[in-house]
């Protein structure tokens, strides 16, 4: 990762675009910290391993988070 852009927040732009949970490889939620004052959500897509920053305030993204956590709770014993 180019060091000059790792100093603070990970996201340069954020997307409102709905993401199909089936196309997700991974979903990372980075809490606010001393390095970045905002919660950041990074989706890693199965296709080409694209990583996309999502808007935590977007209704579509909130629904995605709910769907993913529901799926996780189903899987856990």
């Amino acid at each position: 990762v180019p060091l000059s852009r790792t100093v603070r927040c990970t996201c340069i732009s954020i997307s409102n675009q709905p993401v199909n949970p089936r196309s997700l490889e991974k979903l990372e939620i980075i809490p606010a910290s001393q390095f970045c004052p905002r919660v950041e959500i990074i989706a890693t897509m199965k296709k080409k391993g694209e990583k996309r920053c999502l808007n935590p305030e977007s209704k579509a993204i909130k629904n995605l988070l709910k769907a993913v956590s529901k799926e996780r709770s189903k899987r856990s014993p």
């Epitope: 603070r8 927040c9 340069i12 732009s13 954020i14 675009q17 905002r38 990583k51 996309r52 999502l54």
Partner: antibody, heavy 124, light 109 residues
Framework: QVQLVESGGGVVQPGRSLRLSCAAS????????MHWVRQAPGKGLEWVAV????????YYADSVKGRFTISRDNSKNTLYLQMNSLRAEDTAVYYC?????????????????WGQGTTVTVSS | EIVLTQSPGTLSLSPGERATLSCRAS???????LAWYQQKPGQAPRLLIY???SRATGIPDRFSGSGSGTDFTLTISRLEPEDFAVYYC??????????FGPGTKVDIK
Amino acid sequence: QVQLVESGGGVVQPGRSLRLSCAASGFTFSRFGMHWVRQAPGKGLEWVAVIGYAGDNKYYADSVKGRFTISRDNSKNTLYLQMNSLRAEDTAVYYCAREGAGSNIYYYYGMDVWGQGTTVTVSS
Amino acid sequence: EIVLTQSPGTLSLSPGERATLSCRASQSVSSSYLAWYQQKPGQAPRLLIYGASSRATGIPDRFSGSGSGTDFTLTISRLEPEDFAVYYCQQYGSSPIFTFGPGTKVDIK
């Protein structure tokens, strides 16, 4: 439609200052990182500066570091470039450009929307 | 600092022909960080390709990108009259954060 319109260019003497503005419309400005890119007469493209969507991540090309300041006002949908201590080599067309939705330090989605540019001429 | 070199400097071709433009980096670049732009005289640049091979919105499928490491290619499968322009590759990396290549001019033979 999605649009970026630059203004503030002009003829200025070496050592003086100028502030460029870029008015955004047709999209949610506060969700996108923004860049300034310049092009000297008859030359190629040179990246100048970038600012993150919330206004905190700011980075500059070595050629302008310490002289230029990028900023934004999300309430006014406007991007700025404050240029101080101008030199003859800063003469160029200055473009503002939007960084693609979802861009981050791991994946670069390119500069997907550009303005038509504003011309800055530094001459005595 | 990573330097991008584009070749050839000028490519003279006829409409309908295939154009192959090369972009070479002085050090390895992640394909996640490579983009291509088109610029016509008197106009702003236009994003064609990001992530080395993903077409930007609205870009015709005659444009394709490929490559990895230090060697990247933009291919225009069949040149249309509106494709004659200057093409720039660009990488995002550390210090300077963004770098453009010097450009390749595609002109009419």
